[in-house]
């Protein structure tokens, strides 16, 4: 099994590892499927691409019967199978079988934290946000290892790319020193950013 790892912004080429001459195409059937769901077929030179892939897939007949997925989505991750059948003695017989496992990385960048003064009060507001990752993120605020209550946390998903964005607000009393960590967990991965507030200098230090 061949393994291909790509990021969502990239293009993935999945090779069948087999070549068919133009002359042989009329007597050949080629199937690309992902976990038993059809991606693309070519029968006697006629190609059909399934709707989920139609807008973003190229069949590269000249390069080992590869499929090229242009706008990768997290849901493209999985095992793809290429089957080549050739007509011999009144029947189509399997000439080639290949499996390619595609991993699609969609990592959240380190979150950014911005802060805002709330007029006529000792309260300051910080906002932690990041976008472009998968799977669904879970954001938490921590201080000295203890979880804090955020004002509101929003998680949104882009329907076309399937990627997530997350944003959360936290209010704190600016008369005391603080060190807040914004922690985002997604799948088995995590990213975080720390925000330090020093009352004596009335300034903050994002921890890069």
């Amino acid at each position: 099994v061949i393994h291909v790892t790509k990021e969502v912004k990239e293009v993935a080429t999945l090779s069948c590892g087999h070549n068919v001459s133009v002359e042989e195409l009329a007597q050949t059937r080629i199937y690309w499927q992902k976990e038993k769901k059809m991606v693309l077929t070519m029968m006697s030179g006629d190609m059909n691409i399934w709707p989920e892939y139609k807008n973003r897939t190229i069949f590269d007949i000249t390069n080992n019967l590869s499929i090229v997925i242009l706008a990768l989505r997290p849901s493209d991750e999985g095992t793809y199978e290429c089957v080549v059948l050739k007509y011999e003695k009144d029947a189509f017989k399997r000439e080639h079988l290949a499996e390619v496992t595609l991993s699609v990385k969609a990592d959240f960048p380190t979150p950014s934290i911005s802060d805002f003064e709330i007029p006529t009060s000792n309260i300051r507001r910080i906002i932690c946000s990041t976008s472009g990752g998968f799977p669904e993120p879970h954001l938490s605020w921590l201080e000295n290892g203890e979880e804090l209550n955020a004002i509101n946390t929003t998680v949104s998903q882009d329907p076309e790319t399937e990627l997530y964005a997350v944003s959360s607000k936290l209010d704190f009393n600016m008369t005391t020193n603080h060190s807040f960590m914004c922690l985002i967990k997604y799948g088995h991965l995590r990213v975080n950013q720390t925000f330090n507030w020093n009352t004596t200098k009335q300034e903050h230090f994002p921890d890069n």
Epitope: V11, L70, G132, E160, A165
Partner: antibody, heavy 117, light 107 residues
Framework: QVQLQQSGAELVRPGSSVKISCKAS????????MNWVKQRPGQGLEWIGQ????????NYNGKFKGKATLTADKSSSTAYMQLSSLTSEDSAVYFC??????????WGQGTSVTVSS | DIVMTQSQKFMSTSVGDRVSITCKAG??????VAWYQQKPGQSPKTLIY???NRHTGVPDRFTGSGSGTDFTLTISNVQSEDLADYFC?????????FGSGTKLEIK
């Protein structure tokens, strides 16, 4: 609906720099490559390069390396292109265009840059 | 760089006619080709992507075909509003490259 709004026309001196902007709306700005394309009066289209706002990754046409610098601000959903050491050859209309699967599908209205002393 | 050749600089046609604009790639670009229409003073508008797929809202009189090195944009039942420049683009290899354009004139 997807919209790309570009900054207004620029008249600039030779040797100087100019930064033009492209504000995106109607889609998730971070997740699509933004391309920049040059068109000189009465001529064809030239691809300058592209940026992926999600992480700032860029691809440039070798011809424009050192001439164009692409940046993006996710917080305002705005892409920028800075052109430096301007000459009369840089006088053109510049378009931003979003791409999905490498196809530039939606285009800005264009920004005219005139280099003149 | 991959050169995209549009050999017809100008094409003249009449309303109701069928016209084919061609684009030849300097090397195999599979089906990684798009077609754009540009009217005077306007930005390009996407007609066709991946060689044969119509972009959202494009009338079905516009059809794209081809793969490898030879591509065709066909406009059937030409309308007066089709007066414009037509460009092809390859996005198989960096840098992306455009054809020089074909100006469609209405008799």
């Amino acid at each position: 609906q997807v919209q790309l709004q570009q900054s207004g026309a620029e008249l600039v001196r030779p040797g100087s720099s100019v930064k033009i902007s492209c504000k995106a709306s109607g889609y998730a700005f971070s997740y699509y490559w933004m391309n920049w394309v040059k068109q000189r009066p009465g001529q064809g289209l030239e691809w300058i390069g592209q940026i992926y706002p999600g992480d700032g990754d860029t691809n440039y046409n070798g011809k424009f390396k050192g001439k164009a610098t692409l940046t993006a601000d996710k917080s305002s959903s705005t892409a920028y292109m800075q052109l430096s050491s301007l000459t009369s050859e840089d006088s053109a209309v510049y378009f931003c265009a979003r791409s999905y699967g490498n196809t530039m599908d939606y285009w800005g209205q264009g920004t005219s840059v005139t280099v003149s002393s | 760089d991959i050169v995209m050749t549009q050999s017809q600089k100008f094409m003249s046609t009449s309303v109701g006619d069928r016209v084919s604009i061609t684009c030849k790639a300097g090397q195999n670009v599979r089906t990684a080709v798009a077609w754009y229409q540009q009217k005077p003073g306007q930005s390009p508008k996407t007609l066709i992507y991946l060689a044969s797929n119509r972009h959202t809202g494009v009338p079905d009189r516009f059809t794209g075909s081809g793969s490898g090195t030879d591509f065709t944009l066909t406009i059937s039942n030409v309308q007066s509003e089709d007066l414009a420049d037509y460009f092809c683009l390859q996005h198989w290899n960096y840098p992306f490259t455009f054809g020089s354009g074909t100006k469609l004139e209405i008799k």
